[in-house]
């Protein structure tokens, strides 16, 4: 039966993808073929075949990035390591090891899933505008997150939500493959207006907040918010 | 599990040809590995050809440049093409299909026999 695992890892950081048997198990590195390749986009990672040095096969992509250790695989651990992760690596891998002395059976089948994460940057809150004598607008940016974020809008001086109505978000996919968000809040003008914006990453559980008022340019002091125990208190934590 | 069905074996003189298939029960897109091996009489079963998900293909050198694998999605079939066949290439081919969430499937064999 096939092994499913699951790894996270961040944009630019290496990264081990484990397939190993268990310990004390000794391989002939010319008995075995071990593969690994992407289950969606169907492409070859890396192998190792007897008698073979060269890897032809490998896809551009992870050619010189990813690796399997000859001292472990004599260990039976067939496990990669991929190098500078990049949000296109966000997929699922399967480790195939086969051997020619056991009549071509699958001694290993694991599939690793890799999630991808970046942190964006600390929200960016212009300060309000008019558009009209009684609409306030506010736009909130942040870039080079992954994966996409949500975006939240908040009342500080109750630490209520904002209807999620009175936003537009724009989600760009940026050259780095990584996420851009502007949200822009349109709201009605009143006397005082305390407002933050707050950036999540649900797979960092990750918050970033800042805040905005009318009649001050300067937005609170910027806050990070990591591990909340659940949606609820994780949105209540920031806004305070 | 996956149902598979080698066809093409046969008796054949040296030089010749011959034309494998595999006829797979699903879809052949899913599998991350097709291969192609052969055992003789007496001798452990060896690679013939390896086929990965994204078309690249391993050969072992006894067949390298003779022996070309390929597939048909559409008709989910993975085919083997033997040139120039010697002797030594006389054994029961198998084909096998490997996918993670399935594991491995193998055919019943076909017997090819090179001889004068």
């Known amino acids: 039966d096939t092994q499913e695992k699951e790894v996270r890892a961040m944009v630019g950081s290496d990264v081990e993808l484990s397939c190993a048997c268990p310990e004390g198990s000794r391989f002939d590195l010319n008995d075995v073929y071990v593969y690994w390749q992407t289950s969606e986009s169907k492409t070859v990672v890396t192998y190792h075949i007897p008698q073979n040095s060269s890897l032809e096969n490998v896809d551009s992509r992870y050619r010189n990035r990813a690796l399997m250790s000859p001292a472990g695989m004599l260990r039976g651990d067939f496990s990669l390591r991929l190098f500078n992760v990049t949000p296109q690596d966000e997929q699922k891998f399967h480790c195939l090891v086969l051997s020619q002395s056991l009549g071509f059976q699958e001694v290993l089948s694991v599939e690793v899933t890799l999630h991808v994460a970046a942190n964006f940057s600390v929200p960016v809150v212009s300060a309000p505008h008019s558009p009209s004598q009684d609409e306030l607008t506010f736009t909130c940016t942040s870039i080079n997150g992954y994966p996409r974020p949500n975006v939240y809008w908040i009342n500080k001086t109750d630490n209520s939500l904002l209807d999620q109505a009175l936003q537009n978000d724009t989600v760009f996919l940026n050259m780095r493959g990584l996420y851009d968000v502007v949200s822009v809040l349109r709201i009605a003008r009143t006397p005082s207006v305390n407002i933050g914006c707050c950036i999540e990453n649900v797979l960092l559980q990750q918050n970033l907040t800042v805040g905005s008022q009318t009649g001050n340019d300067i937005g609170e002091r910027d806050k990070i918010t990591e591990n909340p125990v659940s949606t609820g208190e994780k949105n209540a934590a920031t806004w305070s | 599990e996956v149902q598979l069905v080698e066809s093409g074996g046969g008796l054949v003189q040296p030089g010749g040809s011959l034309r494998l298939s595999c006829a797979a029960s699903r879809s052949i897109s899913s599998f991350n590995l097709l291969g192609w091996y052969r055992q003789a009489p007496g001798k452990q079963r060896e690679l013939v050809a390896h086929?990965?998900?994204?078309?690249?293909?391993v050969y072992p050198d006894s067949v390298k440049g003779r022996f070309t694998v390929s597939r048909d999605n559409t008709k989910n079939t993975v085919y083997l093409q033997m040139n120039s066949l010697k002797p030594e290439d006389t054994a029961v081919y198998y084909c096998n299909a490997i996918a993670p969430a399935l594991g491995s499937s193998w055919g019943q064999g076909t017997q090819v026999t090179v001889s004068s």
């Open positions: 086929l990965l998900s994204g078309g690249s293909t």
